[in-house]
């Protein structure tokens, strides 16, 4: 015997209370595939949130985040104050680097300066709190006719594409 | 249709482990869902212990009774969900269930029909 | 930590009467609250979403209101099959280290 729901399409659901016809989603609600009994709840892109996808009765809706924030988590789930480069987010708010580490980005912590010397390498470029240091040849390498090294150019700022 | 189906509980001793399996059908775990976690003591209300998110990432987010000693994870070749948990206590004594939410904000429209775990001696 | 005060913790209704259930959250959850049904022995059901949002499949008879903290769940004729526990639930992710996701403590609705 074949389940009469199995004819429900998608965007609609079995409904058990009017003897297994197949009734739309209610507002706010999808259904992704046929021959449901319920349907799923619609995402809601509310406060930081912004919608990138409206829910439609087959689909959910997806979220990102407004500007001056990023996403974080999963699908979106939570989004987080964008610093500058050389800050990071605190408890507090934005807070400067350290002496020491650096942050290139608008999000994430700052992380400490490459120490040159464990590779051998001498400090080419001086770090700052929004770049790492740049480490040049060992020093050995700098005896008089070596080939100058050009640093390279700064990073572009990544971009904060929806996640 | 969708389901959610619990297994493995039973009896443990305090101080025992367990595991508990959810299967999920008619659904994959690589749609953007949400699968929590959800307790009932014998003649209580619920508390809610755990979630994963089975898309790509499989965030994890624990209630502060469960952190430390519960762990929420995920096979997606099976399609089950797993809760695994160590250091029972008496009052760890629950009906488990699992359910689904597809809003971010921990509203399950579809739950499993419950495993019951008992941490006697 | 969210916390859900529900009121009253029992409620004594006849058949046809109009039942209100309330729910109060510690702090402003907008409008992210569910109302579920549970009968003994049985996993709950979902009847409203984001406070006044009718879930697929449940009678009209059902209805949800409020936002920030003060949340209602009306039964507007209460029906035999609606003797039953109510839970609220409100909820969001916020971080991995501080999560709020929270159940009242439910209202049994019996037979006066």
């Known amino acids: 015997l074949q389940d009469p729901c199995s004819n429900c399409p998608a965007g609609t659901f079995c409904d058990n209370n009017r003897n297994q016809i197949c009734s739309p989603c209610p507002p706010n609600s999808f259904s992704s595939a046929g021959g449901q009994r319920t349907c799923d709840i619609c995402r809601q892109c509310k406060g930081v949130f912004r919608t990138r996808k409206e829910c439609s009765s087959t689909s959910n809706a997806e979220c990102d985040c407004t500007p001056g924030f990023h996403c974080l988590g999963a699908g979106c789930s939570m989004c987080e104050q964008d610093c500058k480069q050389g800050q990071e987010l605190t408890k507090k708010g934005c807070k400067d680097c350290c002496f020491g580490t650096f942050n290139d980005q608008k999000r994430g912590i700052c992380r400490p300066w490459t120490n040159c010397s464990l590779d051998g390498k001498s400090v080419l470029v001086n770090g700052t709190k929004e770049r790492d240091v740049v480490c040049g040849p060992s020093p050995a390498d700098l005896s008089p006719g070596a080939s100058s090294v050009t640093p390279p150019a700064p990073a572009r700022e990544p971009g904060h594409s929806p996640q | 249709s969708q389901s959610l189906v619990e297994s493995g509980g039973g009896l443990v001793q305090p101080g025992g482990s367990l595991r508990l399996s959810c299967a999920a059908s008619g659904f994959s775990f690589s749609s953007n869902y949400w699968i929590c976690w959800v307790r009932q003591a014998p003649g209580k209300g619920l508390e809610w212990i755990a979630c994963?998110?089975?898309?790509?990432?499989?965030?994890?987010y624990y209630a502060s009774s469960a952190k430390g000693r519960f762990t929420i994870s995920r096979d997606n070749s099976k399609n089950t969900l797993y809760l695994q948990m160590n250091s029972l206590r008496a009052e760890d004594t629950a009906v488990y269930y699992c359910?689904?939410?597809?809003?971010?904000?921990?509203?399950?429209?579809?739950w499993g029909q419950g495993t019951l775990v008992t941490v006697s001696s | 930590a969210l916390v859900m005060t529900q009121s009253p913790s029992t409620l004594s209704a006849s058949v046809g009467d109009r039942v209100t259930i309330n729910c109060q959250a510690s702090?402003?959850?907008?409008?992210?609250l569910a109302w579920y049904q549970q009968k003994p022995g049985k996993a709950p059901k979902l009847l409203i979403f984001y406070a006044s949002d009718l879930a697929s499949g449940v009678p009209s008879r059902f209805s949800g209101s409020g936002s920030g903290t003060e949340f209602t769940l009306t039964i507007s004729s209460l029906q035999p099959d609606d003797f039953a526990t109510y839970y609220c639930q409100g909820g969001y992710y916020t971080s991995s280290a501080d999560t709020r996701g929270a159940f009242g403590g439910g209202t049994k609705v019996e037979i006066k």
């Open positions: 359910a689904r939410d597809s809003s971010s904000y921990y509203m399950f429209n579809l």
């Open positions: 994963i998110y089975v898309g790509s990432s499989g965030d994890t």
């Open positions: 702090e402003d959850i907008d409008t992210y």
